[in-house]
Interface confidence: low
């Protein structure tokens, strides 16, 4: 697809882990745009040959979805239109791990940040009352 | 049971061409991406292309690219390799390999001779 | 292009033999590698992933480790169907690359 803006605009990701077996968030916001049809989040990993996820024009659109991503991933549609593109990873898998890129196109640009996420089987922390 | 069945290899003189077909089986062809490899004789494994699930994505190897094009039709559940402008250095066993983590479904293989 | 360089290039080991085969990528290719076994005549077939993933139906006695650029296969007791050439591959970026490969062989 064609790129509307010419200018990079500004997408922030955080590093971040999950818990094999339970849901995991991929953080990344970006510069949000006025109108929601023109923004493309793609969700990439490096190393998987499909994408991990992608939304364009207001739903998402996974015809180019990896088969290991199937049904396991969701972005937060209510607030794509505020500069949320953060992913809903379910049921995390070790083989989740890695290097993740945030995609971001709207009508003012382009841009795109990565992000590590590991995965293991961490505790929760102990809270004494 | 998964399966990969590849056809279509032979003899063909240097400048001709050969179209290699993949046949799947047993798994949804159309959620993976797909590989061709190659195996030269005596020699290790040469990743020649690959194409994702819905032919959005296509990959080639500096040494194919602009002779080989890979493709794929989902109803018929077939993976393609279309070799155009053969050279002798072509010739080897080519494969069809599943997209995963890795390629974790090979198939048989097909050789492909290029000779005058 | 990201190069796998494998050593040893052939190995020579008896029946219960640990065996460790290792593999260097030219630049950090995270845990994105694959190991593969081929017999002569087949097809590959997958034993390792992500860098120490094992494969469903490969037996225990194979393990991989690494991450980064330093990739190890081991295999802690040789059985007589081991006796193969084994492959390491990155699928971190394209083009994707295969090691040259080590022929292990019976002493």
């Known amino acids: 697809f064609g790129i509307s803006g010419r200018h990079s605009i500004t997408v922030t990701t955080v590093a971040s882990a999950g818990n094999i077996g339970e849901d995991g968030i991929l953080s990344c916001t970006f510069e949000p745009d006025i109108k929601l049809s023109d923004i493309v989040i793609q969700w990439l990993k490096e190393g998987v040959l499909g994408l991990v996820h992608e939304f364009k024009e207001g739903k998402d659109e996974l015809s180019e979805q990896d088969e290991m991503f199937r049904g396991r991933t969701a972005v937060f549609a209510d607030q794509v239109i505020v500069g949320n593109a953060s992913l809903r990873l379910k049921n995390v898998q070790l083989t989740d791990a890695g290097t993740y890129k945030c995609y971001i196109i709207t009508s003012k640009g382009k841009g795109n940040a990565n992000l590590e996420y590991k995965t293991g089987a961490f505790s929760m922390p102990e809270v004494n009352v | 049971e998964v399966q990969l069945l590849e056809s279509g290899g032979g003899l063909v003189q240097p400048g001709g061409s050969l179209r290699l077909s993949c046949a799947a089986s047993?798994?949804?062809?159309?959620?993976?991406?797909m590989h061709w490899v190659r195996q030269a004789p005596g020699k290790g494994l040469e990743w020649v292309a690959s194409?994702?699930?819905?032919?959005?994505?296509?990959y080639y190897a500096d040494s194919v690219k602009g002779r080989f094009t890979i493709s794929r039709d989902n109803s018929k559940n077939t993976l393609y390799l279309q070799m155009n402008s053969l050279r002798a250095e072509d010739t080897a066993v080519y494969y069809c390999?599943?997209?995963?983590?890795?390629?974790?479904?090979w198939g048989q293989g097909t050789t492909v001779t290029v000779s005058s | 292009d990201i190069q796998m360089t494998q050593s040893p290039s052939s190995l020579s080991a008896s029946v219960g033999d640990r065996v460790t085969i290792t593999c260097r990528a030219s630049?950090?290719?995270?845990?994105?590698v694959a190991w593969y076994q081929q017999k002569p005549g087949k097809a590959p077939k997958l034993l390792i992933y992500a860098a120490s993933i094992r494969e469903s139906g490969v037996p225990s006695r194979f393990s991989g480790s690494g991450s980064g650029t330093d990739f190890t296969l081991t295999i802690s007791s040789l059985q007589p169907e081991d006796f193969a050439t084994y492959y390491c591959?990155?699928?971190?970026?394209?083009?994707?690359?295969f090691g040259q490969g080590t022929k292990l062989e019976i002493k």
């Open positions: 390999a599943r997209a995963s983590s890795g390629m974790d479904v």
């Open positions: 194409i994702s699930s819905s032919s959005g994505y296509i």
């Open positions: 630049q950090s290719v995270s845990s994105a």
């Open positions: 047993g798994f949804t062809f159309s959620s993976y991406g």
């Open positions: 591959q990155q699928y971190y970026s394209t083009p994707l690359t």
